[in-house]
Structures are given as C-alpha cells and as structure tokens.
C-alpha cells in the first residue's frame, strides 16, 4: 500500500534495508560505514551547489528470528517483512537502498506499488531485468551474457580468428550469489546466450567436468565457470588438460589479478579470467580497509547508491521539481554520475555499465595480462595485447569444436 514518504520541506531521508540475508556475507556495520561515508559526500556536494537541505539515512533491520540463513535462500519474505515494518512505522524515505538478493528484490518489486526508486547492490538475476524503478549498481547477469555472446561471435581479433558457437557450463549449486545468477542466466533455455549458441551443456558434477578435460569426444573446447582460482584448483587440481581446452573463469568482483606481486599458478595457463577493471581510490577509504576485494565492490555499491541519490536530488531540487513523484522514481537511469571512484554510467534500464577485462596467463612471465577490454555500455571489444604469449598453439585461441582447430 501507499506509504507517506519522509521526503520534503528540505529534509530528505534514505531508507536502507539492512537484511540478514545478503548477496555477500558482509557485516552490516561495514555497510553502515559505507552509507555514512556516502552521506558525508552528498551533503558536501549539495552544500557546494548552494542547496541548504538535510539528507539522512534510516537503517531498517530485520529481527533475524525467522530469516536467518545468512545467504539469499530465505530472503524472499525478509524483504517484504521489512517493507511491512517500514509501512507500519510510516518511515519510508525518498529512496530504498537494498535488498541485494535477486529473490527478495523480485518479490518486493512484484508485491508493492513502487512509487519510489529502489537501488540494489546485487539483484543479479535476469528476473530483475527491465524493472522501471530498480537501479542495480553491480553488473547483472544480462551484461555478462552480452559479453559472452559478443566474444563467442568475434573472429577478427589477432588472437581469435574463429567464431564459437558451443560451450560447456559448469554449475554445481554451491556458487556464491553472483555466480549462481550468472550461471543461471547461461543455463536458462530462453536466454540470449542459449539462443545464440548451437550447443550448450551444463556440467553439474565434478567428475563430469574432470572427464571433459581429456575427452576426445567432447562437443566443445570451451568451459565457462564462475569463481576464483582456488575454486578452479579444487576442481581441476593438477590434472592434464587437452591443449585446445579454454576455460573461461568468471570472477568479476575480484581485483587481486591486478596486484603487482601476483603470479599466476600453473593450473591457470588454459584459463581466461573475466573480471572488472579495478577501482583505485577505495583502498585508502576508512570503511574498506579490512574488506576483501569482493566485499569492497559490495560496500562501494552501497556508497555509490547514496551518491546516485544525491546526484538525482540535486538535479530535481535545482529544477524546482518534486521528489515524491513517479518522475523522480523513474529517473535513476540513462545517466552518468560522479561515483566514489570516478564516473558511473547507468544504462536505459538503470543497470550499471562497466568495463569487463579478459585476462590470460603469460607463459613467459607467469603473470596475468590484459587480453582485451569490453565496454558494456556500447557492447564493444577493445583488443589490448596484439601478440599474447598464450599457451595455445600459434598464440591464438583454438576453435571451439575439436578437430576443426588446433588439437
């Protein structure tokens, strides 16, 4: 039902859902710190623009009695319970930040009259695509899918001269929330990825994956999986791998690959890692010093959510427009705003655009090197290394079908 918003007369409130079930196991205190840091920046920006207004955040905690799995499995009802709590207390702000779980975001969007914007650090699944008042500040599955299709089709790069049309996808059900939805999108028979590929099989057992590595009758040389190098090692170990196998390891929210002293282990030589371009200024931030790389991205998304709200608030106030209107609720898209770590671009559907980076392991230096970048905003690939020192024959990626390319 319609809830009155604390969002007028020079006082603007942000409702932050602090859910026990979260896309990343992040102490809520860290997210609070991120939000508070964002508020300080927003207040400064509004003051500099000559706007004398108050901006605050209200943190809404769930009781944690019923919904206590800690991951996203029991998040569906937790989000709705929190909304009910907000409704009963008549404490809705101008904008809702959180939830991060796809299940809860989807359900909340479905079951409420959303006349206010909703900003999510997560909600990766395809079911949260194209929602008119939802903004997602971490790369959703759709963006990954578009990269993969683009890369599969590409055949005019110095190091990739074959179009691919086949793939195995490894998905064993133990994935993190981001990986779960990324792989779910690749698995879905109605998805763009499935539609564009001629052959795709999901491997669900460790043994299935391990057998494919040396199976002469395999239907594809390409295997997509999601996780970090350690996850791959647990699965693959030091097993021999056919020389034309290419493993694509999706590890978007991990910038360890860019650290100076990192050496790629030997088991990564057949692997292309897909990650996001690293942030640079977060490392010195007060709220992020003790965070792992993944959690930095999660906390940063909360912080950027606050900055996004501040950006929109400033625009509407400068134009003398009302904040509690459908126009404001639908405005959080198709724009670029000043994020904590530089400009942040949102697409027409409110999803963050980013630069994905494909890395390979140099056989010369045993370092991760950038092969190409991909700009999700324009769906374009930019080759970076013209002569990669690959493990694959002729320093070119093999064909995806055994027997057609180098074997």
């Amino acid at each position: 039902s319609q809830v009155s918003q604390n969002c007028h007369n020079g006082s603007y409130e942000i409702s932050v859902l602090m859910m026990g079930n979260s896309a990343f196991a992040e102490p809520l205190k860290n997210l609070e710190d991120a939000v508070n840091e964002g508020l300080e920046i927003v207040r400064g920006r509004l003051q500099n623009a000559g706007l004398n207004v108050t901006v605050n955040a209200t943190f809404m905690y769930s009781d944690g009695l019923i919904h206590n799995s800690g991951d996203c499995r029991s998040s569906t009802c937790e989000g709705l319970d929190l909304l009910r709590k907000i409704s009963n207390a008549q404490r809705m702000g101008c904008v809702l930040i959180g939830p991060s779980c796809t299940y809860s975001t989807f359900q909340m969007y479905l079951d409420t009259e959303l006349s206010y914007p909703m900003i999510s650090a997560g909600s990766f699944g395809l079911s949260c695509d194209y929602k008119e008042t939802l903004t997602r500040l971490m790369s959703p599955a759709r963006k990954l899918m578009y990269f993969l299709v683009n890369f599969w089709k590409t055949n005019d790069l110095p190091f990739k001269t074959y179009s691919w049309s086949t793939s195995y996808v490894y998905k064993n059900g133990t994935e993190t929330e981001d990986c779960f939805w990324y792989l779910n999108a690749l698995e879905a028979s109605v998805s763009y990825f499935s539609h564009e590929l001629g052959f795709k099989v999901v491997l669900r057992q460790d043994k299935e994956f391990q057998d494919i590595l040396m199976d002469h009758n395999r239907k594809s040389n390409v295997i997509i999986m999601c996780g970090g190098p350690e996850f791959l090692y647990k699965l693959k170990g030091d097993r021999a791998v056919a020389e034309d196998i290419v493993i694509i390891l999706v590890d978007l929210f991990n910038d360890q690959y860019f650290e100076d002293n990192v050496t790629a282990p030997d088991y990564m030589k057949n692997v292309l890692v897909l990650t996001l371009s690293p942030g640079n200024s977060l490392l010195n931030s007060s709220f992020s010093r003790n965070l792992s790389p993944t959690k930095r991205d999660f906390a940063l998304a909360y912080l950027n959510g606050i900055l996004l709200f501040g950006h929109m608030l400033k625009i509407f106030l400068e134009n003398g427009e009302n904040i509690t209107t459908p126009k404001f609720a639908h405005a959080f898209r198709n724009l670029t705003f000043e994020g904590y770590d530089g400009p942040v671009t949102l697409d027409d559907w409110g999803d963050v655009d980013s630069t994905m980076v494909l890395l390979y392991t140099s056989v010369d230096t045993k370092k991760y090197k950038v092969l190409l970048t991909y700009d999700t905003h324009v769906n374009k690939t930019y080759p970076v290394d013209m002569s990669p020192t690959f493990t694959w024959k002729n320093s070119k990626l093999p064909n995806d079908i055994t027997g057609r390319g180098p074997q």
């Epitope: 400009p343 630069t355 970048t373 930019y382 970076v384 013209m386 002569s387």
Partner: antibody, heavy 118, light 110 residues
Framework: EVQLVQPGAEVKKPGSSVKVSCKAS????????ISWVRQAPGQGLEWMGR????????NYAQKFQGRVTITADKSTSTAYMELSSLRSEDTAVYFC???????????WGQGTLVTVSS | QSGLTQPASVSGSPGQSITISCTGT?????????VSWYQQHPGKAPKLMIY???NRPSGVSNRFSGSKSGNTASLTISGLQAEDEADYYC??????????FGTGTKLTVL
Amino acid sequence: EVQLVQPGAEVKKPGSSVKVSCKASGGTLSSYAISWVRQAPGQGLEWMGRIIPILGITNYAQKFQGRVTITADKSTSTAYMELSSLRSEDTAVYFCARDQRPASMDVWGQGTLVTVSS
Amino acid sequence: QSGLTQPASVSGSPGQSITISCTGTSSDVGGYNYVSWYQQHPGKAPKLMIYEVSNRPSGVSNRFSGSKSGNTASLTISGLQAEDEADYYCSTVTSLSTYVFGTGTKLTVL
C-alpha cells in the same frame, strides 16, 4: 559527443620537462585508449605512446621509452603526457587522440604547441 | 620502429581517382587488420578517414576507400575534389602492441 581539450602552448627550456594535459569534455575517458602523437614543424605524425585510462596500462614507442610518461586521472577524465630531458628537436605540436579501435584515432585534441628554446 | 613507407607526393585532376600506398612488414601492416588512414589539412588536427583497413567512419564520403594486400595497404580517393588536397597518413599496430604512422603523402589536386 566527447571532445578532447588541450592547453594552447607551452615554452620550455632545454633539459626541463613538460606535462601536457588532455581533458575529455562531454564524456569520460572510458575503456578506450588515449594516444599521444606529435608533429614537428613541417614534419609528419609521430606516435609516442598510449594509455588505457581505466586500467592504467601504457605502451610507448621505443624512441621515447624512458623519456615519456603517460598517465590518466579517471576522476577528472584527464590524460597527461610528460616528456623529460627536453631538447630543441622536441619542439612540436603534441596531440592527444582517443582510439576506440586499435590505431583508429577518431577524436583528436586541438594540439598543444611545445616550444623548447633557451 | 621507423615509419611505414608512403610516397612523398601524389597528384590528380578533379574527377580522377588516385591511390596512396603504405608499405610495412609482416609485424605491422601485414600482421593485423588494423590499418587506418588520416587526412590532415594545414594547421589542423588529423581526421580519421578509414579504420580497420576498409571501414569508413560515419560522415566520411564514400569516395574514400581502403584495402590491403600482404604488407601493403592502400587508400583510394575517387572523383577527386579540391577539398581533398591535404596530407594523408596511414597507421597501424605492431606486434609490440604499439602504433606506427606512415611517412605521409602530400596530395595535390591539379
């Protein structure tokens, strides 16, 4: 539509350094490369190096290796080219340019004339 | 890396076609389909005319076309016009992931 804005001119003494800026207005530096190209009076174009701002990856022409440093500040969408140990033959117009595809520089700055003279 | 080799000058009458060559090695022109061509009028910044051997950016006349054979790339301008008079440069990537320009060709429209 992105434009690259450069300062008009710089006068430097031999042996000193120059740092030329290149600001993207109407857009960001994004994931593409920014190249630096120079042109001495009456001469051809000479590629000096490039940076991919979002990653900080640089490549330099062998001729300038050790003498040129290209950097970028993502937060201000500005790229910089610093050339050290200047000599009179470094007198040239220095252009920055964006390449959306390798070696395809589709947007150019207006150029900065650097004069090296004692 | 010294520049790619181009003829110093080329001329033609209005309405005619001319071709400018750009010769490199298998480590640059011959090795990659990343050859570009630029037009530069005196005192102005260069303008991209052709990229990736034969693609034209939007806004560039279809009188300009590009091709490549082995280690040599070519720019052809058909139906020459007075405003085509300018300097033309080719460029490409190298196996070191650097770029290199051609020596430049002065086009005179007679």
